[in-house]
Interface confidence: medium
Amino acid sequence: GSMKVLQEPACVSDYMSISTCEWKMGGPTNCSAELRLLYQLVFQSSETHTCVPENNGGVGCVCHLLMDDVVSMDNYTLDLWAGQQLLWKGSFKPSEHVKPRAPGNLTVHTNVSDTVLLTWSNPYPPDNYLYNDLTYAVNIWSENDPAYSRIHNVTYLKPTLRIPASTLKSGISYRARVRAWAQHYNTTWSEWSPSTKWYNSYREPFEQRHHHHHH
């Protein structure tokens, strides 16, 4: 029988070199064996490229489209084929569907006496438009204290966050992760970075602890 697309391909771009398209088929499908997603930049002399999809669950497929780079006016035609059968035809403008890359190298510095300093890396090179447009959300939680989970919004450009160590409980471990979005490109949030763990050994000075104890 003929194959059918149940949920049309939806694509997001990292605005650098990869766009990811996901879709669902009408029944169990071996995506890499049975399907091909062809994509072509709408431009006078561009070539057609072929993406071999991977399975993403029983009926889901995902394809990673490689692009030399991305500029704001780019528009791609997309054709989903099953052998000689054209299942779906559409188009995709990367600049209108941006999901930033996840920040990397999240590091926690606890050697400053009363401050926990978190730093991470901007996932884009300086010549990319998103480089100076990213803002971040830092999620801090504790496995020892399930009630504790905070989101810190970092709306300045520098990929750092300072937290007074006194706002965290002493003697327990915390985890942090960070994600990004770009305001001017109306992007979705990136995936979370891998989390990093640290032990909060900070103890308030005796006077302050004594003061807290009596109030």
Epitope: F43, Q44, S45, S46, D68, V71
Partner: antibody
Framework: DVQLQESGPGLVKPSQSLSLTCTVT?????????WNWIRQFPGNKLEWMGY???????SYNPSLKSRISITRDTSKNQFFLQLNSVTTDDTATYYC?????????????WGQGTTLTVSS | QIVLSQSPAILSASPGEKVTMTCRAT?????MHWYQQKPGSSPKPWIY???NLASGVPARFSGSGSGTSYSLTISRVEAEDTATYYC?????????FGAGTKLELK
Amino acid sequence: DVQLQESGPGLVKPSQSLSLTCTVTGYSITSDYAWNWIRQFPGNKLEWMGYISYSGSSSYNPSLKSRISITRDTSKNQFFLQLNSVTTDDTATYYCAGGGLRRRGLFDYWGQGTTLTVSS
Amino acid sequence: QIVLSQSPAILSASPGEKVTMTCRATSSVTYMHWYQQKPGSSPKPWIYATSNLASGVPARFSGSGSGTSYSLTISRVEAEDTATYYCQQWSSIPLTFGAGTKLELK
């Protein structure tokens, strides 16, 4: 570092054929890009003449189509321009340039140009 | 073919001044490129796909536009910017260039 170098006769008589060579170093002409010929007339007007792509396909400016040919020698990493039945209007500086196909029509690499005079 | 008209033909500016030159196309184009050319040299890629600065181009340069109207702006002109600037399209064959805007310093 990609470099392009034009070479040619400098002076051609009217009605004769013009042959120019572009030697590319630092990049294989079969790897990527369109390899173009562009000329600049004495008044500085630039005109795209045509290209041969990395795959060997070619495209020409319709205004020159009847008398232009662009070919290549992949073993020498060179491409060539032949322009037939030249007139004094073909007097110009001739540039070879690489780019175009995947760069949304931008010419990334240019030779330094060779001046051609058509005169009897 | 798509004809590109650049204006002004000659632009005279004082150092530190902001200048804008325009390129108009007879039909809509998707990408517009700009080149800088100095006497005795070949054109250099300057702005790629409307607004992206080529490698090594100072940040005082910017490009914008869409459809049939594009522009190149220099926020604060410097002596080294003295050159002729050409726009170029490849939305249709033949690829075409504008006639150029010559930037001079007062």
